[in-house]
């Protein structure tokens, strides 16, 4: 494709409170956003779309509602027990009718393991999706259904951010077209045949991922016929050229010095806010060393942070990081040895990430101790082990066939940990929920969307 | 090439006993497990007794509890199965086998087989 061409979809952000709560800083947060869709423009970047290639995601505004927000009335996300399907609606009764997405990041426990819910955009006739204009709805109310939703939260525990990533283009991908993946071409995590089994699920899977599977972070051909379709038809109405920076959306761009956003959100002494005139915008201020939209090493003041400043907490697998000194950016941590036991001594730390199953240090690999091989349902949540594809030694780390590593010790999987090969997660109980992939859906059936809009909306 | 080597078995009198041999060879004894396994004509193989080579641990099935022990020779890379009160259900084929990763009485999880010595108990 050509750089003229409009493949570039425009994505409203907003966070909420909890996320911010969670994340603690606006800087943490925007680190967040960015990093999330860096991870989704990274995905549909390199996926062919039946010919349409290179799409690309730009964020071209973000709202961060902090904890100062939580009892303001204008702040629809307010409230602190609201169910998936409300907190979506809240989303779309906004008109955003300037982006092809609008998404709000939370991190609040949904029923039933659900990371996010988002409405199915098809090709002609429906209701949802990319570039879908706010309109009137047989409810009484205006929507926007170019929307979605995601939490980084599931069953009291925060996903893995490859698995927020994975979810993050889950839900994007049922705005560009795509149902969940059904049959066994597209489901081949459950296939009985090994090989194909262990490359996982692709990215519209229905139930549960751990993200680091060779398919997980995939399109399936059912996603990709879907998409494609619906690329084709819908583009045009709200795809914009690649290429320029967007001065305002808080994240400092190729050819911007910094990036606080616009003048109702800039809270920096460093940076011109993008409501300034074409030559100032997203330029530092006369003087000014750096802004700390540029990173966690600058100080309000300005200035580099000291040689000695902490910018990133130690971690399981990584040493804490230190500002050098010269540069507003957080080096480089130093990573942890391998081999390192990692969350809750369920993994185990390869360069520097948490992600490795702790079989791994014992020269096995982990497998699920699935009721589907006769398995008792209490082991659905323990850490089961087996011998390199030999699905018939998987055990549990509690059993005698692997006490000479884990002494007879249980380990059992951190609470929202993906179970029974992938069909639900583990509760805080240590039972494995099953995801049911549809619940929402049948929940709003019930609600105030008139019937034509059933089909539109998923997890 | 690993190797495991049974002996010992033999025909005995139900109340008799019999010291079984598997004398390993073609790998580094103490990072293994050794497990006894039997099979008698028209059954499954089952466990017996294991014992972790590098701290002694061992286990052992509920039919042998008391009758049966398991112990090794570290020096001779070797572990035997001391078989007291026998009876004529231990009437099998006894195999020997080793694994650097697993332990228990599941035969799935070893790797590696002896080819048997035969053990009969008359009553």
């Known amino acids: 494709t050509t750089s003229a061409e409009k493949n570039t979809c425009q994505l409203y952000i907003q966070t909420d409170h909890l996320f911010f709560k969670y994340y603690g800083t606006r800087e943490a947060v925007i680190a967040q956003i960015s990093s999330h869709v860096k991870a989704i423009d990274t995905i549909y970047q390199t996926t062919d779309f039946s010919g349409i290639r290179n799409i690309s995601f730009m964020v071209k505004r973000i709202r961060i509602n902090t904890t100062a927000d939580e009892k303001d009335p204008t702040n629809p996300f307010r409230f602190p027990n609201i169910g998936v399907e409300k907190f979506l609606e809240l989303n779309s009764e906004q008109n955003h009718d300037d982006y092809c997405l609008a998404y709000v990041f939370t991190d609040r426990d949904f029923d039933d393991g659900v990371l996010g819910l988002a409405w199915v955009g098809a090709p002609s006739g429906s209701s949802g999706g990319i570039c879908e204009k706010s309109k009137l709805y047989s409810d009484g109310k205006k929507k926007s259904l170019n929307t979605g939703i995601i939490t980084v939260q599931n069953y009291g525990s925060h996903v893995p951010p490859k698995v927020s990533h994975i979810t993050f283009a889950h839900e994007v991908g049922h705005n560009f077209g795509s149902p969940h993946d059904s049959g066994t071409e597209c489901t081949p995590g459950e296939s009985k045949n090994l090989g194909q089994k262990e490359n996982g699920n692709y990215i519209m899977y229905a139930r549960a991922t751990s993200g680091d599977k060779l398919n997980n972070n995939k399109f399936s051909l059912c996603s990709i016929r879907n998409i494609s379709q619906v690329l084709e038809k819908k583009r045009n109405n709200c795809f914009v050229e690649s290429g320029q920076p967007i001065c305002g959306n808080g994240m400092v761009e190729q050819g911007e010095e910094c990036d606080c956003g616009y003048s109702d959100q800039c809270k920096d002494e460093c940076c011109f806010d993008a409501n300034q005139p074409e030559g100032r915008k997203c330029k530092l201020k006369p003087g000014k060393q750096c802004s700390p939209s540029q990173g966690p090493c600058c100080t309000a003041q300005c200035a580099f942070k000291s040689k000695s400043e902490k910018c990133r907490d130690d971690s399981d697998c990584a040493r804490e990081g230190i500002c050098n000194g010269f540069t507003a950016l957080c080096p480089a941590s130093d990573p942890k040895p391998n081999f390192t036991d990692c969350n809750r001594h369920t993994q185990v730390c390869i360069n520097g990430q948490c992600a490795g199953s702790i079989c791994e240090k014992y020269g096995l690999e982990e497998c699920t101790c699935a009721s589907s091989d006769g398995k008792d349902d209490k082991e659905l949540c323990h850490v089961c082990c087996m011998k390199k594809m030999d699905p018939s030694t998987c055990a549990s780390t509690g059993s005698v066939q692997w006490s000479r590593h884990f002494s007879g010790r249980t380990i059992t999987l951190q609470p929202g940990s993906p179970c029974n090969d992938f069909r639900g997660y583990c509760d805080v109980f240590m039972r494995c929920r099953l995801v049911d992939a549809d619940g929402p859906l049948a929940r709003l059936k019930k609600a105030i969307f008139s019937p034509e809009l059933y089909e539109n909306i998923a997890e | 090439k690993v190797q495991l080597v049974e002996s010992g078995g033999g025909l005995v009198q139900a109340g008799g006993s019999l010291r079984l041999s598997c004398a390993a060879s073609?790998?580094?004894?103490?990072?293994?497990?050794i497990g006894w396994f039997r099979q008698a004509p028209g059954k499954e193989r089952e466990g017996v007794s294991c014992i972790s080579i590098s701290d002694s641990s061992t286990y052992y099935a509920d039919s042998v509890k008391g009758r049966f022990t398991i112990s090794s020779d570290n020096a001779k890379n070797t572990v035997y199965l001391q078989m007291n009160s026998l009876k004529p259900e231990d009437t099998a084929v006894y195999y020997c086998a080793a694994d650097r990763l697993a332990y228990g009485l599941d035969p799935n999880f070893y790797d590696y087989w002896g080819q048997g010595t035969q053990v009969t108990v008359s009553s």
């Open positions: 073609g790998f580094t004894f103490g990072d293994y497990a």
